[in-house]
């Protein structure tokens, strides 16, 4: 037999299918020009020493073969002895290691069998009523096709599906969408209405994320507040990467999960902008304010479940940085200015179990005064910090108040509001004999002591009503008792106590009269 012809003799090997798992498959035959034809196939398994034979049976029942050697592609003309206008059955037999392996048969009319392409170029993926919709441009001059898809997940083998007949310039397919795992899809096409025509090759992989992006599993921590009033938010655990099917590993456009960080600054609610969204890779610096941080995962189908973390406020206080002066017109605060043209946010909140909402005020951008201080003033009528109770004050600063990540903490401290000197006056002053020349003076703690760092000291004044001599005794703010010694029996004394802050001298308590009785010996 000539090599260019189909040989109508018995092939040069025994006729027995080994039934092995390897062997030839995916046989495709089609016309490639007016008078030439091509068949190609795949071979699975070791290729060394394998000889391939393309078998053909005509409708008359006569059969022939082409010897392809080690090649998996073979061309022949319409003069090769194979009928091209009538239906023929073709298959491949591969002779290897003393056994024959057979491909599945294809039955077709060669003249009408056109080589169909798989979907080429961009395959658009969208979600439609809980299913996956794929859409692509029909390859040139190939309108009218049957389309199949196959899909797999990281843990499952290929499953075959049907897209149905297509007859337009664009083709589409509805496929199943997995909720929680990524999928790899491939598509193939063949001529519509041409009985037994060959399937095209499979398309390049189309990688599809799960409907729900994976929930981010992250952990945050926050560093100490630095000298600049900012602290770094750090990510302790990166989000886990999505497991991908084999053909999507490496570069897998379409399956990407993006993680975004949504910052919500809870402190200073009077500022212009409370939230900001950032990429997870770019960890921001924060002020000492309280924040909620949401990590939002999203893929091409939209956002998924988020995870929300709370970053408590940094409550480290600076007891001396804030100077408060109370005048007849109102109250003014002074603190070391940060820089030129800074906007400050002053926030105050009543301290204690009843909590109470934080109130704040935003200053216009201001430069430092000649002493390098920034100021904020308010009138008594405004009612700000007007109640006689303890307030926690925080001052934030920013040169760009519209940018959430550029705020810094200037200071945090406590302040006793209202008329602190009067409100702080100690009550329930009592005097008890201690010895022949001394007494113990006790009092109830001043209201100022509920405000950390505000009460500087108590002062106890003792006045000798005879000589009008006065002595004053400073007492630590944590103490509520002092012993007065060197007193004389039979003399009348008055004792008073006051509570002082760093800025204000307190109001004396009501005078308490006492005397040490003269001891009469028998």
């Amino acid at each position: 037999c000539r090599t260019s012809e189909c040989c109508f003799q018995d092939p040069p090997y025994p006729d027995a299918d080994s039934g092995s798992a390897s062997g030839p498959r995916d046989l495709r035959c089609y016309r490639i020009s007016s008078d030439r034809y091509e068949c190609s196939w795949q071979y699975e398994g070791p290729t060394a020493g394998v000889s391939h034979f393309l078998r053909c049976c005509l409708s008359s029942g006569r059969c022939c073969y082409f010897a392809a050697g080690s090649a998996t592609r073979l061309q022949f003309s319409d003069q090769a002895g194979v009928s091209v206008l009538y239906t023929v059955t073709l298959w491949v037999e591969s002779w290897a290691r003393n056994q024959t392996e057979k491909s599945p048969e294809v039955t077709l009319q060669l003249y009408n069998s056109v080589k169909y392409e798989p979907p080429l170029g961009d395959i658009k993926v969208s979600k439609l009523a809980g299913q996956l919709r794929m859409e692509w441009e029909t390859p040139d001059n190939q309108v009218g096709a049957e389309v199949q898809f196959r899909h797999r997940t990281p843990s499952s083998p290929w499953k075959l599906g049907d897209c149905g007949p297509q007859d337009d310039d664009t083709e589409s397919c509805l496929c199943p969408l997995e909720m929680n795992v990524a999928q790899e899809f491939q598509l193939r096409r063949r001529q519509l209405g041409s009985q037994g025509s060959s399937w095209s090759k499979w398309s390049s992989p189309v990688c599809v994320p799960p409907e729900n992006p994976p929930q981010p599993q992250v952990r945050f921590s926050v560093e100490q507040l630095g000298q600049d009033g900012r602290r770094r938010l750090t990510l302790k655990e990166q989000p886990t990467q999505l497991e991908l099917p084999e053909g999507c590993q490496g570069l897998a456009p379409g399956t990407e999960v993006t993680y975004r960080l949504q910052l919500h600054m809870l402190s200073c609610p009077c500022k212009a902008k409370a939230t900001r969204t950032l990429h997870l890779g770019k960890m921001p610096y924060l002020s000492g304010a309280a924040y909620n941080v949401a990590v939002i995962s999203s893929n091409q189908f939209g956002p998924g479940l988020n995870q929300t973390w709370h970053i408590p406020a940094d409550t480290h206080t600076e007891p001396v940085a804030l100077n408060i002066s109370v005048g007849t017109n109102g109250t003014t605060m002074y603190w070391p200015a940060r820089a030129q043209s800074m906007t400050y946010c002053i926030e105050w909140q009543p301290v204690g179990q009843d909590g109470g909402l934080a109130t704040c005020s935003l200053t216009a951008p201001q430069d430092p005064d000649p002493a390098g201080m920034a100021t904020y003033s308010w009138s008594r009528e405004s009612g700000a910090m007007g109640q006689e109770k303890c307030y926690y004050i925080t001052i934030f600063a920013s040169a760009h108040p519209e940018k959430l990540t550029l705020w810094s903490t200037v200071l945090s401290t406590y302040h006793f509001g209202g008329n602190a000197s009067a409100a702080g006056t100690p009550h329930h002053v009592s005097v008890k004999n201690h010895s022949l020349d001394s007494v113990s003076v006790d009092w109830a703690p001043s209201l100022l002591s509920t405000c950390p760092g505000v009460l500087k000291e108590y002062v106890v004044r003792c006045r000798d009503e005879d000589s009008k001599q006065v002595s004053e005794h400073p007492v630590q703010p944590t103490e509520t008792q002092v012993t007065l010694s060197g007193l004389r029996a039979g003399v009348a004394y008055t004792v008073q106590v006051r509570a002082d802050t760093a800025w204000l001298r307190g109001v004396w308590s009501q005078p308490q009269r006492f005397s040490i009785e003269v001891q009469v010996s028998d």
Epitope: S221, N292, T308, W309, H310, G355
Partner: nanobody
Framework: EVQLVESGGGLVQAGGSLRVACAAS????????MAWFRQAPGKEREFVAH????????VYPDSVRGRFTISRDNAKNTVYLQMNSLKPEDTAVYYC???????????????????WGQGTSVTVSS
């Protein structure tokens, strides 16, 4: 120790409203935040609402935002969950949880909280 007791659950028609309460007792001065979670039969526990004890800032998931409101009465040491426009899928046992201390924590995770109540059952019929 902190003890949490939920109340106010019951049966309600779809579209109706219900208010559940959680009363805290014991070392409540250490409370930093409170939250509500819920668990429907055969499902995982789900975050519903969160409130800071001081200041009252709140967080909700998309599933209840706009329908549920968390609030607190510090003087009574009680946190409330007002549920409006109830749906059959809101049927669950509702638990309140308390957070002490001031460390960084995940708001929507049951494990972040230090104390939990026994739960109150809410059934929404269609």
């Amino acid at each position: 120790e902190v003890q949490l007791v939920e109340s106010g659950g019951g049966l309600v028609q779809a579209g109706g409203s219900l208010r559940v309460a959680c009363a805290a007792s014991g070392r409540t001065f250490s409370t930093y935040a409170m939250a509500w979670f819920r668990q429907a039969p055969g499902k995982e526990r789900e975050f519903v609402a969160h409130i800071l004890w001081s200041g009252g800032s709140t967080v909700y998931p998309d599933s209840v935002r706009g329908r549920f409101t968390i609030s607190r009465d510090n003087a009574k040491n009680t946190v409330y969950l007002q549920m409006n426009s109830l749906k059959p899928e809101d049927t669950a046992v509702y638990y309140c949880a308390q957070k002490s201390g001031r460390q960084v924590y995940r708001i929507d995770s049951w494990d972040s909280f230090d104390y939990w109540g026994q739960g109150t059952s809410v059934t929404v019929s269609s």
